[in-house]
Interface confidence: low
């Protein structure tokens, strides 16, 4: 039975050209995390494998940095980076847990946000 929950940074916004940290945390389960995938809609951004470490997708290697922790740092943001991001925890024996973050990249000089947790 899957008992875990994912806590995330929620719905966030940032300014064009800036940087942002995306972070998730899996709790309430003793399952072993074997791999975490970071995806933007249908694109794979990065993988953190328990044995092999980090792999950043070549198309994002100039703008994506691993960490902190199992999180992901997005740099040199563009308006096109607006959208849904998913942290996908592959665990044993539970299976897969997914957390969702919505990022809005704003042109304006003041980036307002209403951060909320998404806990599936």
């Amino acid at each position: 039975m899957m008992t875990g929950t994912i806590e995330t940074t929620g719905n966030i916004s940032a300014e064009k050209g800036g940087s942002i940290i995306l972070q998730c945390h899996l709790s309430s389960t003793t399952a072993q995390v074997t791999q975490v995938n970071w995806e933007q809609q249908d694109q794979l951004l990065a993988i953190c494998n328990a044995d092999l470490g980090w792999h950043i997708s070549p198309s994002f290697k100039d703008r994506v940095a691993p960490g902190p922790g199992l999180g992901l740092t997005l740099q040199s943001l563009t308006v096109n980076d607006t959208g849904e991001y998913f942290c996908i925890y592959h665990t044993y024996p539970d299976g897969t847990y997914t957390g969702r973050i919505f990022l809005e990249v704003l042109e304006s000089s003041v980036a307002e946000h209403g951060a909320r947790f998404q806990i599936p």
């Epitope: 940074t9 940032a14 800036g18 940087s19 972070q23 945390h25 946000h113 209403g114 951060a115």
Partner: nanobody
Framework: EVQLVESGGGLVQPGGSLRLSCAAS????????MGWFRQAPGKEREWVAS???????WYADSVKGRFTISADNSKNTAYLQMNSLKPEDTAVYYC????????WGQGTLVTVSS
């Protein structure tokens, strides 16, 4: 409008301790994610630690085991307890919501020197 106000900085000797506070006002802490960054003279701003409302924390390797981040949701305040301070910890310390910065405070100066 969101405002973040840091306090608690000052001059301390190597090996000493300080506790920084960051008071948030406005619609900011509802997301429950706060972070501390620092900027040393002539260097880029670097991430130090962050905390989610549920209490989970992350630390930069350079401060792990010496610094502790925490938050009091009821007071909309985040804290950074800094122990075993080193001269290389000298910097202006900033708090922020959500990663590198939807909102930033003005910073508080920490100087570690004998």
């Amino acid at each position: 409008e969101v405002q973040l106000v840091e306090s608690g900085g000052g001059l301390v000797q190597p090996g000493g301790s300080l506790r920084l506070s960051c008071a948030a006002s406005g619609n900011t802490f509802s997301g429950g994610f706060m972070g501390w960054f620092r900027q040393a003279p002539g260097k880029e701003r670097e991430w130090v630690a962050s905390v989610l409302r549920g209490g989970y924390t992350w630390y930069a390797d350079s401060v792990k085991g010496r610094f502790t981040i925490s938050a009091d949701n009821s007071k909309n305040t985040a804290y950074l307890q800094m122990n075993s301070l080193k001269p290389e910890d000298t910097a202006v310390y900033y708090c922020t919501t959500v990663g590198y910065g939807d909102y930033w405070g003005q910073g508080t100066l920490v100087t570690v020197s004998s």
